[in-house]
């Protein structure tokens, strides 16, 4: 049976350009190695934002230069994307792959619409 992935429909980024959401997957098998990828879809173009592979029971680690951080707990991944600007507003899709042991399973969420509003510049003080 195919794998289902759930994520919130909408998230509003903080004034500091940080957005967090939970990605939950219904694992059909007993995976020991999982890969989580965040994709951004804009105008039917899909790009990879970040990706991390982790062993079940361990923390997931993104590359040092990644704009993503995250924690895992069972079949749930808490994702945080930072450094967002208004132009980054868009649909962010959670993709989960059960890499090992076979069989491989793919799960793709419906996406989380992240809205980013650039903060107003502070007025000059006299």
């Amino acid at each position: 049976k195919a794998m289902h992935v759930a994520q919130p429909a909408v998230v509003l980024a903080s004034s500091r350009g940080i957005a967090s959401f939970v990605c939950e997957y219904a694992s059909p098998g007993k995976a020991t190695e999982v890969r989580v990828t965040v994709l951004r879809q804009a105008d039917s173009q899909v790009t990879e934002v970040c990706a991390a592979t982790y062993m079940m029971g361990n923390e997931l680690t993104f590359l040092d230069d990644s704009i993503c951080t995250g924690t895992s707990s069972g079949n749930q991944v808490n994702l945080t994307i930072q450094g967002l600007r208004a132009m980054d507003t868009g649909l962010y899709i959670c993709k989960v792959e059960l890499m090992y042991p076979p069989p491989y399973y793919l799960g793709i969420g419906n996406g989380t619409q992240i809205y980013v509003i650039d903060p107003e510049p502070c007025p000059d003080s006299d």
């Epitope: 049976k1 195919a2 794998m3 890499m99």
Partner: antibody, heavy 109, light 102 residues
């Protein structure tokens, strides 16, 4: 190329135009006049590989990300392995979004 | 996949079916293949058109039953069409449906 039954052959597929190490890569084959048959996949850094039953034990998929190249080592070849072999990219959304032009392998004595 | 061959005239509507042995959720793609060429993706995720695919191609269905529809056949659409599930390994293809000129 043409190869005798029982012999070995290594196929290669060199990719360009995308970040090779960010994508899974597949081999798919097609026997003359027949349909498409998935053979094997290798993921990202090459640490995970999955095979069709028909390929297990005889075929080995590998990749060299520094050379943007995908390989298929085929051992103990049989007549039924005669096919066009395609490499294909596993797109970000999972489907096979780009395909190579294919290589004809003929196993015959 | 059914039928094995579909004989139609240009301008007609083509309806191709694909049935999975178990639920593949939304991980279902359609590919077109012409003689001597590699397959090219038409539809992914059941109903999303791949890059550059004209809107006369559409996909629908859910669970185990899926359909590819070509609303008005153009001369270049006569080819073999394959469905494929890509959610679980092994990634299986249907046997194909040949759309030929009546």
């Amino acid at each position: 190329g043409v190869v005798e039954p029982g012999r070995s052959l290594r196929l290669s597929c060199t990719a360009s135009g995308f970040t090779f190490s960010s994508y899974g890569m597949h081999w798919v084959r097609q026997a003359p006049g027949k349909g498409l048959e998935w053979v094997a996949v290798i993921w990202y850094d090459g640490s995970n590989k999955h095979y069709a039953d028909s390929a297990k034990g005889r075929f080995t998929i590998s990749r060299d990300n520094s050379k943007n190249t995908l390989y298929l080592q085929m051992n103990s070849l049989r007549a039924e392995d005669t096919a066009v072999y395609y490499c294909a990219r596993a797109g970000l959304l999972g489907y096979f979004d780009y395909w190579g032009q294919g290589t004809l392998v003929t196993v015959s004595s | 996949q059914s039928p094995g061959t579909l004989s139609l005239s240009p301008g007609e509507r083509a309806t191709l079916s694909c049935r999975a042995s178990q639920s593949v959720s939304s991980y279902l793609a359609w590919y077109q293949q012409k003689p001597g060429q590699a397959p090219r993706p038409l539809i992914y995720g059941v109903s999303s058109r791949a890059t550059g695919i004209p809107d006369r191609f559409s996909g629908s269905g859910s669970g185990t039953d899926f359909t590819l529809t070509i609303s008005r056949l153009e001369p270049e659409d006569f080819a073999v069409y394959y469905c494929q599930q890509y959610g679980i390994s092994p990634f299986t293809f249907g046997p194909g449906t040949k759309v030929d000129i009546k």
